[in-house]
C-alpha cells in the first residue's frame, strides 16, 4: 500500500524520494509521474532527471533538494484538490529489471478558515509527518514510520533546528532511500 502524505490547498506539497549515488556525480535517471508506478516509466511523467541534470519538468513540479546527491524529493507548488492522488518515484537503475519504484499517496485537505502560523505551515509543507524508513539495499522492503506530532510550542525549537540543518538531515535519513553500488 502507498505511504500517505498530506498538504493543504495553497501549500507546497513535499513527496520524499532519495537514493545514494554510487559515487559523487554518478547519477541515475529518475522519473516522477502522476499515478501508481507501472511496470516501466512513471505513468504520466511530470519530471525527469538523467545522468546529469533535470531534463524535463512541468509547471509547479520541481526538485527542491540536491538531486546530485540523490535527493530527488518532489515539491508540488501551490497545490489544489486536483493534485490529490498517487505519485510514482522511479529510480531507473541500469541493468536487468533493477528499477526501484515508490508509490506515494498525496492527500490534499481544504485550507483552514483561520490561517495557521506561517512557520508551522512552512514546516508541515516541507516535511510531512509520515515518512518511509531508510532502506539499506535495493531488495529491502520500505516500511512506514511516523514522526511524532508537533505542537505549536515546538515550532520555534524546530525552526532553530532546521536552521542548523540537523533536523533536516535526520528527516532526510528517514526518507525512502536506495543505495546504488
Amino acid at each position: 500500500s502507498e505511504v500517505e502524505y498530506r498538504a493543504e490547498v495553497g501549500q507546497n506539497a513535499y513527496l520524499p524520494c532519495f537514493y545514494t549515488p554510487a559515487a559523487p556525480g554518478n547519477l541515475v535517471p529518475v522519473c516522477w509521474g502522476k499515478g501508481a508506478c507501472p511496470v516501466f516509466e512513471c505513468g504520466n511523467v511530470v519530471l525527469r532527471t538523467d545522468e546529469r541534470d533535470v531534463n524535463y519538468w512541468t509547471s509547479r513540479y520541481w526538485l527542491n533538494g540536491d538531486f546530485r546527491k540523490g535527493d530527488v524529493s518532489l515539491t508540488i507548488e501551490n497545490v489544489t484538490l486536483a493534485d490529490s492522488g498517487i505519485y510514482c518515484c522511479r529510480i531507473q537503475i541500469p541493468g536487468i529489471m533493477n528499477d526501484e519504484k515508490f508509490n506515494l499517496k498525496l492527500v490534499i485537505k481544504p485550507a483552514k478558515v483561520t490561517p495557521a502560523p506561517t512557520r508551522q505551515r512552512d514546516f508541515t509543507a516541507a516535511f510531512p509527518r509520515m515518512l518511509t524508513t531508510r532502506g539499506h539495499g535495493p531488495a529491502e522492503t520500505q516500511t512506514l514510520g511516523s514522526l511524532p506530532d508537533i505542537n505549536l510550542t515546538q515550532i520555534s525549537t524546530l525552526a532553530n533546528e532546521l536552521r542548523d540543518s540537523r533536523l533536516a538531515n535526520d528527516l532526510r535519513d528517514s526518507g525512502a532511500t536506495i543505495r546504488i553500488g
Partner: antibody, heavy 122, light 107 residues
Framework: EVKLVESGGGLVQPGGSLRLSCAAS????????MAWVRQAPGKGLEWVAN????????YYLDSLKSRFTISRDNAKNSLYLQMNSLRAEDTAVYYC???????????????WGQGTLVTVSS | DIQMTQSPSSLSASVGDRVTITCRAS??????LAWYQQKPGKAPKLLVY???TLAEGVPSRFSGSGSGTDFTLTISSLQPEDFATYYC?????????FGQGTKLEIK
C-alpha cells in the same frame, strides 16, 4: 507512417541460436521503449522482453532471461533479440512492438511488426 | 505474476449486436490495461490503452472501462470486420501478461 519490420526468423535445431532484428521507421526510435512479444501456433500472446530508450535497462520473462538478450542500436533504428539454447517450445511468431514513450502516458503496444516465424525442430 | 482472465473464451454474435468482453486481473493494476484485436495471420492491433482511451484510428463503437481488477471492452454495434480474437494485457507488473483471448465468431 510508423513501420516495424522483423527479420531473422527461420528453422533452427534444438540447442541452436538465432538473432532476430526489427527495423523501425516513421518515429523517433530513441524516444520509446521497445518490446518483443511471441505467439506459439494456435496459442495466445506472450510477452518476451522490453528495453528502455538507450538500452541501459532491460526486462525479461523470468523463464527466458538466461537464454534471450534484448538490445537496440538507436543509430540504426534497430531492435534485436538474441536467442540461445533454443527449445521446441520457443517455436512461435515473434513480434517487435513499440511500447511507452519518453513522457509515459500511453501504456499499450501501439504498433506491431508483421512478425517473423521461428521454428525449433530437429 | 499477475494473471489476466478473460471471459467468455468464445462468443457468437450477429452484425449489429452489442458485445461485452470482460477481463479480470488477479491483483490491482489500476488503469494499466490495454485491449487488442487480432485477425488470423495478422499482428495484433491496439484498440484501447489505459483501460479507457481509444487508440488512434479505432472506431468509436469500441469502448473500454474499468479500473483496479475488473475491466470491460464493449462493441456497441458489431460490424463484419469486428469478428476476430480479442486480448487484454496489463502494463502494471512484471512480467507483462495477456489474457487467454476471446474469440468472437459470427452466429
Amino acid at each position: 507512417e510508423v513501420k516495424l519490420v522483423e527479420s531473422g526468423g527461420g528453422l533452427v535445431q534444438p540447442g541452436g541460436s538465432l538473432r532476430l532484428s526489427c527495423a523501425a521507421s516513421g518515429f523517433t526510435f530513441s524516444d520509446y521503449y521497445m518490446a518483443w512479444v511471441r505467439q506459439a501456433p494456435g496459442k495466445g500472446l506472450e510477452w518476451v522482453a522490453n528495453i528502455n530508450y538507450d538500452g541501459s535497462s532491460t526486462y525479461y520473462l523470468d523463464s527466458l532471461k538466461s537464454r534471450f538478450t534484448i538490445s537496440r542500436d538507436n543509430a540504426k533504428n534497430s531492435l534485436y533479440l538474441q536467442m540461445n539454447s533454443l527449445r521446441a517450445e520457443d517455436t512461435a511468431v515473434y513480434y517487435c512492438a513499440r511500447d511507452v514513450g519518453y513522457y509515459g502516458g500511453n501504456y499499450g503496444f501501439a504498433y506491431w511488426g508483421q512478425g517473423t516465424l521461428v521454428t525449433v525442430s530437429s | 505474476d499477475i494473471q489476466m482472465t478473460q471471459s467468455p473464451s468464445s462468443l457468437s454474435a450477429s452484425v449489429g449486436d452489442r458485445v461485452t468482453i470482460t477481463c479480470r486481473a488477479s491483483d490491482n493494476i489500476y488503469s494499466y490495461l490495454a485491449w487488442y484485436q487480432q485477425k488470423p495471420g495478422k499482428a495484433p492491433k491496439l484498440l484501447v490503452y489505459n483501460a479507457k482511451t481509444l487508440a488512434e484510428g479505432v472506431p468509436s463503437r469500441f469502448s473500454g472501462s474499468g479500473s483496479g481488477t475488473d475491466f470491460t471492452l464493449t462493441i456497441s454495434s458489431l460490424q463484419p470486420e469486428d469478428f476476430a480474437t480479442y486480448y487484454c494485457q496489463q502494463h502494471y507488473g512484471s512480467p507483462l501478461t495477456f489474457g487467454q483471448g476471446t474469440k468472437l465468431e459470427i452466429k
